[in-house]
Protein backbone atom coordinates (compact mmCIF):
# COMPACT_ATOMS: atom_id res chain seq x y z
CA UNK A 1 0.00 0.00 0.00
CA UNK A 2 0.84 3.25 -0.60
CA UNK A 3 1.33 3.69 3.42
CA UNK A 4 4.49 1.86 3.14
CA UNK A 5 6.18 4.81 1.99
CA UNK A 6 4.93 7.62 4.37
CA UNK A 7 7.47 8.12 6.90
CA UNK A 8 9.81 10.98 6.07
CA UNK A 9 11.91 9.90 9.14
CA UNK A 10 12.25 6.47 7.47
CA UNK A 11 13.52 7.44 3.57
CA UNK A 12 16.49 8.73 2.43
CA UNK A 13 16.18 11.30 -0.45
CA UNK A 14 15.51 10.91 -3.79
CA UNK A 15 17.69 8.52 -5.92
CA UNK A 16 17.81 5.58 -7.75
CA UNK A 17 17.26 2.23 -6.25
CA UNK A 18 18.53 -0.84 -7.83
CA UNK A 19 15.89 -3.85 -9.48
CA UNK A 20 16.40 -6.35 -11.65
CA UNK A 21 13.13 -7.52 -13.24
CA UNK A 22 12.42 -11.12 -14.56
CA UNK A 23 9.77 -11.43 -17.23
CA UNK A 24 8.71 -14.66 -15.77
CA UNK A 25 7.22 -12.68 -12.71
CA UNK A 26 5.57 -10.64 -15.02
CA UNK A 27 4.75 -13.47 -16.99
CA UNK A 28 5.52 -12.43 -19.93
CA UNK A 29 8.21 -15.52 -20.64
CA UNK A 30 5.57 -16.86 -23.35
CA UNK A 31 6.44 -14.05 -25.77
CA UNK A 32 9.87 -12.63 -25.04
CA UNK A 33 12.36 -14.91 -25.72
CA UNK A 34 15.28 -12.65 -24.38
CA UNK A 35 16.43 -11.50 -22.36
CA UNK A 36 15.24 -13.36 -19.58
CA UNK A 37 14.82 -10.12 -17.41
CA UNK A 38 16.78 -6.58 -17.15
CA UNK A 39 18.07 -4.28 -14.60
CA UNK A 40 15.24 -1.85 -14.84
CA UNK A 41 15.90 0.11 -11.29
CA UNK A 42 13.49 2.88 -9.91
CA UNK A 43 12.93 5.71 -7.95
CA UNK A 44 12.66 6.47 -4.72
CA UNK A 45 12.67 8.88 -1.45
CA UNK A 46 11.93 12.69 0.02
CA UNK A 47 12.21 15.32 -2.05
CA UNK A 48 11.57 17.50 1.01
CA UNK A 49 13.41 21.14 1.72
CA UNK A 50 15.68 21.77 1.87
CA UNK A 51 16.73 20.44 -1.82
CA UNK A 52 20.16 20.38 -3.35
CA UNK A 53 22.26 20.11 -6.52
CA UNK A 54 21.92 16.21 -6.01
CA UNK A 55 18.36 15.54 -6.36
CA UNK A 56 18.25 17.25 -9.87
CA UNK A 57 14.96 19.42 -9.14
CA UNK A 58 13.08 21.50 -11.55
CA UNK A 59 12.45 24.90 -11.29
CA UNK A 60 8.54 24.02 -11.05
CA UNK A 61 9.54 20.95 -8.01
CA UNK A 62 11.50 24.18 -6.05
CA UNK A 63 8.60 26.54 -6.13
CA UNK A 64 6.33 23.18 -5.21
CA UNK A 65 8.76 22.06 -2.30
CA UNK A 66 8.47 25.83 -1.17
CA UNK A 67 4.63 26.14 -1.47
CA UNK A 68 4.19 22.60 0.16
CA UNK A 69 6.11 24.37 3.87
CA UNK A 70 3.45 26.64 3.71
CA UNK A 71 0.28 24.52 2.68
CA UNK A 72 1.27 20.85 3.51
CA UNK A 73 -2.55 19.48 3.63
CA UNK A 74 -2.97 21.54 -0.09
CA UNK A 75 -0.02 20.76 -2.11
CA UNK A 76 2.15 17.84 -1.73
CA UNK A 77 5.91 17.84 -2.00
CA UNK A 78 6.90 17.20 -5.01
CA UNK A 79 7.67 13.56 -6.29
CA UNK A 80 10.89 10.97 -7.11
CA UNK A 81 11.02 10.35 -10.71
CA UNK A 82 13.09 8.95 -13.44
CA UNK A 83 15.28 11.90 -15.10
CA UNK A 84 17.08 10.19 -17.44
CA UNK A 85 15.83 6.86 -19.01
CA UNK A 86 16.96 4.30 -21.29
CA UNK A 87 15.85 1.31 -23.61
CA UNK A 88 16.52 -1.76 -24.10
CA UNK A 89 16.45 -4.22 -26.87
CA UNK A 90 14.09 -7.30 -26.64
CA UNK A 91 13.48 -10.68 -29.08
CA UNK A 92 9.72 -11.81 -28.80
CA UNK A 93 7.22 -14.13 -30.48
CA UNK A 94 4.82 -11.91 -33.25
CA UNK A 95 1.26 -12.99 -33.68
CA UNK A 96 2.25 -14.68 -36.33
CA UNK A 97 4.76 -16.59 -34.26
CA UNK A 98 8.03 -14.85 -36.09
CA UNK A 99 11.04 -13.88 -34.04
CA UNK A 100 11.45 -9.86 -33.93
CA UNK A 101 13.99 -7.75 -32.58
CA UNK A 102 12.44 -4.76 -30.92
CA UNK A 103 13.82 -1.67 -29.09
CA UNK A 104 11.26 -0.65 -26.41
CA UNK A 105 11.95 3.05 -25.42
CA UNK A 106 12.21 4.43 -21.42
CA UNK A 107 12.64 0.98 -19.92
CA UNK A 108 15.59 1.55 -17.60
CA UNK A 109 15.84 4.48 -15.19
CA UNK A 110 19.50 5.71 -15.27
CA UNK A 111 18.68 9.03 -12.91
CA UNK A 112 16.04 10.19 -10.40
CA UNK A 113 15.05 13.53 -9.36
CA UNK A 114 12.51 15.63 -7.61
CA UNK A 115 9.68 16.56 -10.16
CA UNK B 1 3.32 15.86 5.84
CA UNK B 2 4.07 13.52 3.42
CA UNK B 3 1.59 11.27 5.64
CA UNK B 4 -1.46 13.64 3.97
CA UNK B 5 -0.79 11.94 1.13
CA UNK B 6 -0.99 8.40 1.68
CA UNK B 7 -4.86 6.81 1.09
CA UNK B 8 -5.34 5.26 -1.80
CA UNK B 9 -9.22 5.43 -1.09
CA UNK B 10 -9.26 9.04 -0.60
CA UNK B 11 -7.39 10.15 -3.88
CA UNK B 12 -7.86 10.49 -7.43
CA UNK B 13 -5.94 9.36 -10.32
CA UNK B 14 -3.03 10.88 -11.40
CA UNK B 15 -3.78 14.61 -12.70
CA UNK B 16 -3.01 17.94 -13.17
CA UNK B 17 -4.17 20.14 -10.19
CA UNK B 18 -4.89 24.06 -10.41
CA UNK B 19 -2.16 25.93 -8.10
CA UNK B 20 -1.40 29.83 -8.42
CA UNK B 21 1.39 31.19 -6.32
CA UNK B 22 1.84 34.31 -5.32
CA UNK B 23 5.88 35.52 -5.26
CA UNK B 24 5.55 37.53 -2.00
CA UNK B 25 4.22 34.45 -0.28
CA UNK B 26 7.60 32.95 -1.34
CA UNK B 27 9.05 36.09 -0.29
CA UNK B 28 10.36 36.98 -3.62
CA UNK B 29 8.71 40.61 -3.88
CA UNK B 30 12.05 41.94 -3.20
CA UNK B 31 13.67 41.06 -6.78
CA UNK B 32 11.24 40.29 -8.53
CA UNK B 33 9.04 42.96 -10.00
CA UNK B 34 6.12 41.42 -12.48
CA UNK B 35 4.73 39.45 -12.54
CA UNK B 36 3.08 39.41 -9.23
CA UNK B 37 2.85 35.64 -9.50
CA UNK B 38 1.94 32.64 -11.77
CA UNK B 39 -0.60 29.84 -12.21
CA UNK B 40 2.20 26.59 -11.46
CA UNK B 41 -0.34 23.92 -10.98
CA UNK B 42 1.06 20.76 -9.70
CA UNK B 43 0.34 16.78 -10.15
CA UNK B 44 -0.98 14.78 -7.65
CA UNK B 45 -3.41 11.77 -7.74
CA UNK B 46 -2.26 7.72 -7.54
CA UNK B 47 -0.78 5.43 -10.43
CA UNK B 48 -2.49 2.28 -9.94
CA UNK B 49 -3.25 -1.05 -11.56
CA UNK B 50 -4.87 -0.52 -14.30
CA UNK B 51 -2.82 2.12 -15.78
CA UNK B 52 -4.59 3.52 -18.91
CA UNK B 53 -3.70 5.53 -21.43
CA UNK B 54 -4.98 9.17 -19.78
CA UNK B 55 -1.92 8.43 -17.24
CA UNK B 56 0.89 9.06 -19.67
CA UNK B 57 2.69 6.04 -17.79
CA UNK B 58 6.06 5.77 -19.47
CA UNK B 59 7.12 1.56 -20.00
CA UNK B 60 9.01 1.61 -16.62
CA UNK B 61 6.30 2.92 -15.06
CA UNK B 62 3.97 0.45 -16.09
CA UNK B 63 7.44 -2.81 -15.92
CA UNK B 64 7.18 -1.03 -12.09
CA UNK B 65 3.19 -1.11 -11.41
CA UNK B 66 3.63 -5.10 -11.91
CA UNK B 67 6.37 -5.18 -9.90
CA UNK B 68 4.20 -2.79 -6.78
CA UNK B 69 1.45 -5.46 -7.11
CA UNK B 70 3.52 -8.16 -6.56
CA UNK B 71 6.34 -6.55 -4.10
CA UNK B 72 4.25 -3.77 -2.99
CA UNK B 73 6.74 -3.65 0.44
CA UNK B 74 9.65 -3.41 -1.35
CA UNK B 75 8.88 -1.01 -4.48
CA UNK B 76 6.58 1.91 -4.37
CA UNK B 77 3.96 2.75 -7.00
CA UNK B 78 4.99 5.16 -10.07
CA UNK B 79 4.43 8.96 -8.85
CA UNK B 80 2.59 11.50 -10.30
CA UNK B 81 4.47 13.82 -12.17
CA UNK B 82 4.70 16.60 -14.76
CA UNK B 83 5.18 15.14 -18.39
CA UNK B 84 5.30 18.71 -19.78
CA UNK B 85 6.51 22.14 -18.64
CA UNK B 86 6.28 25.64 -19.84
CA UNK B 87 8.73 28.74 -19.16
CA UNK B 88 8.00 31.70 -17.31
CA UNK B 89 9.31 35.55 -17.97
CA UNK B 90 10.43 37.32 -15.01
CA UNK B 91 10.92 41.04 -14.60
CA UNK B 92 13.64 41.14 -12.03
CA UNK B 93 16.46 43.48 -10.60
CA UNK B 94 20.11 42.31 -10.69
CA UNK B 95 22.68 42.52 -8.62
CA UNK B 96 23.47 46.28 -10.16
CA UNK B 97 20.02 46.88 -9.77
CA UNK B 98 18.97 46.84 -13.22
CA UNK B 99 16.10 45.75 -14.92
CA UNK B 100 16.01 42.18 -16.46
CA UNK B 101 13.69 40.38 -18.24
CA UNK B 102 14.47 36.72 -18.28
CA UNK B 103 13.22 33.44 -18.89
CA UNK B 104 12.82 30.97 -16.20
CA UNK B 105 12.47 27.25 -17.71
CA UNK B 106 10.22 24.49 -16.48
CA UNK B 107 7.60 26.78 -13.94
CA UNK B 108 4.39 25.54 -15.02
CA UNK B 109 2.82 21.95 -15.32
CA UNK B 110 0.83 21.64 -18.21
CA UNK B 111 0.44 18.23 -17.98
CA UNK B 112 0.79 15.34 -15.30
CA UNK B 113 1.68 11.82 -15.65
CA UNK B 114 2.45 8.22 -14.06
CA UNK B 115 6.74 8.00 -14.04
CA UNK C 1 27.38 33.46 -9.82
CA UNK C 2 26.69 33.36 -5.87
CA UNK C 3 29.83 34.27 -3.52
CA UNK C 4 29.56 32.93 -0.28
CA UNK C 5 31.58 34.49 2.81
CA UNK C 6 31.44 32.54 6.32
CA UNK C 7 32.84 34.09 9.35
CA UNK C 8 32.54 33.20 13.31
CA UNK C 9 34.10 30.08 13.48
CA UNK C 10 36.82 29.36 16.27
CA UNK C 11 37.77 27.93 19.36
CA UNK C 12 34.46 27.52 22.25
CA UNK C 13 34.44 25.33 25.39
CA UNK C 14 31.66 22.95 25.57
CA UNK C 15 28.40 24.44 26.86
CA UNK C 16 29.42 27.61 25.29
CA UNK C 17 27.78 29.64 22.17
CA UNK C 18 28.72 31.01 18.62
CA UNK C 19 27.15 33.09 16.01
CA UNK C 20 28.01 32.07 12.48
CA UNK C 21 27.64 34.54 9.49
CA UNK C 22 27.29 33.83 5.76
CA UNK C 23 27.04 37.10 3.51
CA UNK C 24 25.91 36.34 -0.37
CA UNK C 25 26.55 38.29 -2.99
CA UNK C 26 26.23 38.21 -6.72
CA UNK C 27 23.28 36.80 -8.29
CA UNK C 28 21.14 36.76 -5.35
CA UNK C 29 17.89 37.48 -6.72
CA UNK C 30 17.57 33.71 -7.64
CA UNK C 31 18.53 32.30 -4.00
CA UNK C 32 15.66 30.27 -3.15
CA UNK C 33 16.89 29.25 0.19
CA UNK C 34 20.48 29.77 2.57
CA UNK C 35 21.28 27.01 4.78
CA UNK C 36 24.44 25.06 7.12
CA UNK C 37 26.16 22.22 6.23
CA UNK C 38 28.45 20.62 8.55
CA UNK C 39 31.51 17.94 8.02
CA UNK C 40 34.03 16.42 10.12
CA UNK C 41 37.15 14.23 8.22
CA UNK C 42 35.37 10.99 7.14
CA UNK C 43 31.82 11.89 6.64
CA UNK C 44 29.15 13.14 4.33
CA UNK C 45 28.19 16.53 4.99
CA UNK C 46 24.99 16.83 7.33
CA UNK C 47 22.41 19.05 7.47
CA UNK C 48 22.74 21.44 10.12
CA UNK C 49 19.68 24.46 9.36
CA UNK C 50 18.24 25.75 6.18
CA UNK C 51 15.78 28.98 5.91
CA UNK C 52 13.47 30.25 2.27
CA UNK C 53 13.18 32.91 1.37
CA UNK C 54 9.62 33.60 3.40
CA UNK C 55 11.64 32.85 6.57
CA UNK C 56 10.29 28.86 6.67
CA UNK C 57 12.84 26.45 8.11
CA UNK C 58 14.28 22.80 8.88
CA UNK C 59 16.94 21.92 11.11
CA UNK C 60 19.09 18.65 11.05
CA UNK C 61 18.69 15.76 13.99
CA UNK C 62 21.94 17.61 15.75
CA UNK C 63 20.55 21.08 15.42
CA UNK C 64 17.40 21.23 16.88
CA UNK C 65 16.60 22.30 20.05
CA UNK C 66 20.38 23.81 19.98
CA UNK C 67 20.61 26.23 16.98
CA UNK C 68 18.73 28.60 15.56
CA UNK C 69 18.89 29.76 11.89
CA UNK C 70 18.05 33.44 10.98
CA UNK C 71 18.23 35.36 7.80
CA UNK C 72 18.30 39.17 6.92
CA UNK C 73 17.68 39.63 3.52
CA UNK C 74 18.52 43.37 3.60
CA UNK C 75 21.62 42.44 4.14
CA UNK C 76 21.60 39.06 1.80
CA UNK C 77 23.28 37.67 5.30
CA UNK C 78 22.14 34.31 7.32
CA UNK C 79 23.21 33.66 10.66
CA UNK C 80 23.06 30.26 12.55
CA UNK C 81 22.97 30.83 16.79
CA UNK C 82 24.31 28.02 18.31
CA UNK C 83 24.10 26.95 21.67
CA UNK C 84 24.96 24.75 24.13
CA UNK C 85 27.78 23.34 22.30
CA UNK C 86 29.19 19.94 22.47
CA UNK C 87 32.60 18.49 21.62
CA UNK C 88 30.59 16.59 18.97
CA UNK C 89 29.67 19.78 17.02
CA UNK C 90 33.50 20.09 16.27
CA UNK C 91 33.21 20.20 12.38
CA UNK C 92 34.12 22.60 9.49
CA UNK C 93 30.86 24.53 9.16
CA UNK C 94 29.76 25.09 5.28
CA UNK C 95 26.88 27.98 4.07
CA UNK C 96 24.91 26.86 1.28
CA UNK C 97 22.61 28.80 -1.21
CA UNK C 98 20.01 27.20 -3.21
CA UNK C 99 18.82 28.53 -6.62
CA UNK C 100 16.45 28.28 -9.28
CA UNK C 101 18.41 26.62 -12.74
CA UNK C 102 19.24 28.91 -15.13
CA UNK C 103 19.62 28.32 -18.20
CA UNK C 104 19.65 24.91 -16.99
CA UNK C 105 16.67 22.38 -16.08
CA UNK C 106 17.76 21.96 -12.41
CA UNK C 107 18.23 24.31 -9.44
CA UNK C 108 22.11 25.06 -8.13
CA UNK C 109 23.82 25.00 -5.29
CA UNK C 110 26.57 27.48 -4.16
CA UNK C 111 28.54 26.54 -1.10
CA UNK C 112 31.06 28.81 0.34
CA UNK C 113 34.38 27.67 1.90
CA UNK C 114 33.75 26.69 5.37
CA UNK C 115 34.29 28.33 9.02
CA UNK C 116 35.66 25.24 11.41
CA UNK C 117 33.98 24.93 14.97
CA UNK C 118 36.20 23.69 17.45
CA UNK C 119 34.73 22.70 20.79
CA UNK C 120 36.51 21.82 23.65
CA UNK C 121 35.74 19.13 26.67
Known amino acids: SASDYNSSELKTACRKHELYVSFQDLGWQDWIIAPKGYAANYCDGECSFPLNAHMNATNHAIVQTLVHLMNPEYVPKPCCAPTKLNAISVLYFDDNSNVILKKYRNMVVRACGCH | SASDYNSSELKTACRKHELYVSFQDLGWQDWIIAPKGYAANYCDGECSFPLNAHMNATNHAIVQTLVHLMNPEYVPKPCCAPTKLNAISVLYFDDNSNVILKKYRNMVVRACGCH | EVQLVESGGGLVQAGGSLRLSCAASGSIFSIVSMGWYRQVPGKQRELVAA???????NYGDSAKGRFTISRDNAKNTVYLQMNSLKPEDTAVYYC???????????????WGKGTLVTVSS
Open chain 3, 51 to 57: ITSAGST
Open chain 3, 96 to 110: NSYGLGYPGDYGIDY
